[in-house]
């Protein structure tokens, strides 16, 4: 039994890091393998993660961690029984994938303005709480070409757009994702999408 693709890990910069790797053949990850991990810190202890299968030869492990700070470094040991298959380390702050925003809501009752709001996925004491920016994706269910992205570069988790920038009388969907420039993170997954029917009063033409 050998590791074909070494573990790569990403952290949500809160409490979970996810590590994925591939073996050289079909493997029952949960029965054959264990990933041991430990924060390099005087007051830390070793933890064991039981991996799950992720395709025939792929394995994935969800590591429960202490609140992350930038200096954290974890040792990783992948074991098959008594055999050490791979040894490495992981700095969560260097491989961050933020949590997805939640509670996306479209408020349509504000005088021909659409107000989209969502929740910051981090608590206020987390470093990323004040460092997230967002991308909002809006698309038409009727017209695949009607697809747009709004970049929200301010901290407030909301977006205002004129309803008239979208077509009236049809249904739209929206979703939002986040990233943090300070740690050069990847984008989060998209939030679940929300649907609304776009309608607004056309302004009277003045002759």
């Amino acid at each position: 039994m050998k590791v074909l693709q070494e573990p790569t890990c990403v952290s949500d910069y809160m409490s979970i890091s996810t590590c994925e790797w591939k073996m050289n053949g079909p493997t029952n990850c949960s029965t054959e393998l264990r990933l041991l991990y430990q924060l390099v810190f005087l007051l830390s202890e070793a933890h064991t993660c039981i991996p799950e299968n992720n395709g025939g030869a792929g394995c994935v492990c969800h590591l429960l961690m202490d609140d992350v700070v930038s200096a954290d470094n974890y040792t990783l040991d992948l074991w098959a029984g008594q055999q050490l298959l791979w040894k490495g380390s992981f700095k969560p702050s260097e491989h961050v994938k933020p949590r997805a925003p939640g509670n996306l809501t479209v408020h349509t009752n504000v005088s021909d303005t659409l107000l989209l709001t969502w929740s910051n996925p981090y608590p206020p004491d987390n470093y990323l709480y004040n460092h997230l920016t967002y991308a909002v994706n809006i698309w038409s269910e009727n017209d695949p070409a009607d697809f747009r992205i709004y970049n929200v570069t301010y901290l407030e988790p909301s977006l205002r757009i004129a309803a008239s920038t979208l077509k009236s009388g049809i249904s739209y969907r929206a979703r939002v994702r986040a990233w943090a420039q300070c740690y050069n993170t990847t984008w989060s997954e998209w939030s679940p999408s929300t649907k609304w029917h776009n309608s607004y009063r056309e302004p009277f033409e003045q002759h």
Partner: antibody, heavy 115, light 109 residues
Framework: EVQLVQSGGGLVHPGGSLRLSCAGS????????MFWVRQAPGKGLEWVSG???????SYADSVKGRFTISRDNAKNSLYLQMNSLRAEDMAVYYC?????????WGQGTLVTVSS | EIVLTQSPGTLSLSPGERATLSCRAS???????LAWYQQKPGQAPRLLIF???SRAPGIPDRFSGSGSGTDFTLTISRLEPEDFAVYYC??????????FGQGTKVEIK
């Protein structure tokens, strides 16, 4: 807002015991290492003890064998049991959250050791 | 055990002046594990700088940290009246734990 609220200081005779408490709020207590740091009157800061999320502990040589740090994650609380107290243990004791450094501190509680 | 020595013991300056505080370690310290604190009379210490040069949340940008190895510096670019206090450096070591410097008092001249 992260808050650490301390209680339990007071006057104790040499050789006596005292228990300090620290209640945390505004953060996930169970995922953070916690510490005690003290400051003798007119002196600098001295690290006393720390406890990790899994219960691993460490002590300054000056208190080893006399002080015991503990935590109760269900109550979001940190404790310091101080036995065989000496005159040189007299100080303001601070609880703190942190790891390699201490990012939030309690208000401090004075421990006076005097006969 | 790593010993941190701060200098000067006392720094007498006027508001608006630049303050430069030194922290020297008896052996090499990882920059990731060097922090600075401010303490005012009757108050708990407040984290200013971590990782030798990163400002803690809410700390004004007139505070900056620098250095590596055994020599670290805290600089206050323009002293405000509320900056007069005692400043401590602190390091963490995987075997010895946490140690503080003896402090530098910044007082009004």
């Amino acid at each position: 807002e992260v808050q650490l609220v301390q209680s339990g200081g007071g006057l104790v005779h040499p050789g006596g015991s005292l228990r300090l408490s620290c209640a945390g709020s505004g953060f996930t207590f169970s995922r953070n290492a916690m510490f005690w740091v003290r400051q003798a009157p007119g002196k600098g800061l001295e690290w006393v003890s720390g406890i990790g999320t899994g219960g691993a502990t460490s002590y300054a040589d000056s208190v080893k064998g006399r002080f015991t740090i503990s935590r109760d994650n269900a109550k979001n609380s940190l404790y310091l049991q101080m036995n065989s107290l000496r005159a040189e243990d007299m100080a303001v004791y601070y609880c703190a959250r942190g790891r390699y450094y201490f990012d939030y501190w309690g208000q401090g509680t004075l421990v006076t050791v005097s006969s | 055990e790593i010993v941190l020595t701060q200098s000067p013991g006392t720094l007498s300056l006027s508001p608006g002046e630049r303050a430069t505080l030194s922290c020297r370690a008896s052996q090499s310290v990882s920059s990731s594990y060097l922090a600075w604190y401010q303490q005012k009379p009757g108050q708990a210490p407040r984290l200013l700088i971590f990782g030798a040069s990163s400002r803690a949340p809410g700390i004004p940008d007139r505070f900056s940290g620098s250095g590596s190895g055994t020599d670290f510096t805290l600089t206050i670019s323009r002293l405000e009246p509320e900056d007069f206090a005692v400043y401590y450096c602190q390091q963490y070591d995987h075997s010895a734990g946490w140690t503080f410097g003896q402090g530098t008092k910044v007082e009004i001249k």
